[in-house]
Amino acid sequence: MMTGTIETTGNISAEKGGSIILQCHLSSTTAQVTQVNWEQQDQLLAICNADLGWHISPSFKDRVAPGPGLGLTLQSLTVNDTGEYFCIYHTYPDGTYTGRIFLEVLESSVAEHGARFQIP
């Protein structure tokens, strides 16, 4: 039975040209996390494999940085980065857990950032 839950940064906004940290945290399960995949709508952005470490998609390497932790940092944001992002936790023996974050990139310099989630 899958007992785990994923907490995320939820809906967040950021300023064009700036950067943002996407964070997810899996709790309430003793399952082993084997890999975390980060996806943007229909594009695979990055993979963090427990054995092999971080691997960023070559097409996003200039704007995506691993971490902190299992999170993902998006840099040099453009309005086109607005949309849904998913953290997919591959675990054993539970299976797959998915968290969703909505990012809005604003032209304005007064972008209101959503509540920041920090993993202890």
Epitope: N37, Q43, L44, I47, L52, S57
Partner: antibody, heavy 117, light 107 residues
Framework: EVQLVQSGAEVKKPGASVKVSCKAS????????IEWVRQAPGQRLEWMGV????????NYKEKFKGRVTITADKSSSTAYMELSSLRSEDTAVYYC??????????WGQGTTVTVSS | DIVMTQSPDSLAVSLGERATINCKAS??????VAWYQHKPGQSPKLLIY???YRYTGVPDRFSGSGSGTDFTLTISSLQAEDVAVYYC?????????FGGGTKVEIK
Amino acid sequence: EVQLVQSGAEVKKPGASVKVSCKASGYAFTNYLIEWVRQAPGQRLEWMGVINPGSGGTNYKEKFKGRVTITADKSSSTAYMELSSLRSEDTAVYYCARGEYFFFDYWGQGTTVTVSS
Amino acid sequence: DIVMTQSPDSLAVSLGERATINCKASQHVSTGVAWYQHKPGQSPKLLIYSASYRYTGVPDRFSGSGSGTDFTLTISSLQAEDVAVYYCQQHYNTPHTFGGGTKVEIK
């Protein structure tokens, strides 16, 4: 120029072990994964496992766990794949490949391993 | 394990004509798919990665598309040197499984 040069063909008896080497040159060895893939006669390509030479971390296909060991020697930029308890169905061409984001952009020339009594 | 199912198993196409190869993943793999060309006696060669990105030096007659579970490799105008077996591979999660291959021949 990126190159992966593998060791030569091997003939082994059932129950024996084989160790195939893969010497990398032309790039920073610790910055990329080394993956091992085999192809038995008439079969599809089959992924066996992978090593991160920088960290030493490995990941193996479940069916090979306990029988395959992948190692890497940073000083010589060489990766090794050892397969034990060989059986006839292990007869195949074994390839090492450089892993970039888990796809394989450069391949070794292949090493034919024949298991026969 | 994620199963990659390729179709057709073989394909005969006239020179200059279009060849289309399909690959279906047994579960979601986002854009984590690569395509390889394998000629007899040679090592496989990377053509496409991340579903649609052409690898350096690959002729532009090769293109890839798809996301999720359904993927396509297209050779827009088949040349004699394109005769080979083509494999899809998912690089979304370990183990990094391959399709069964599609043999492309000249009609």
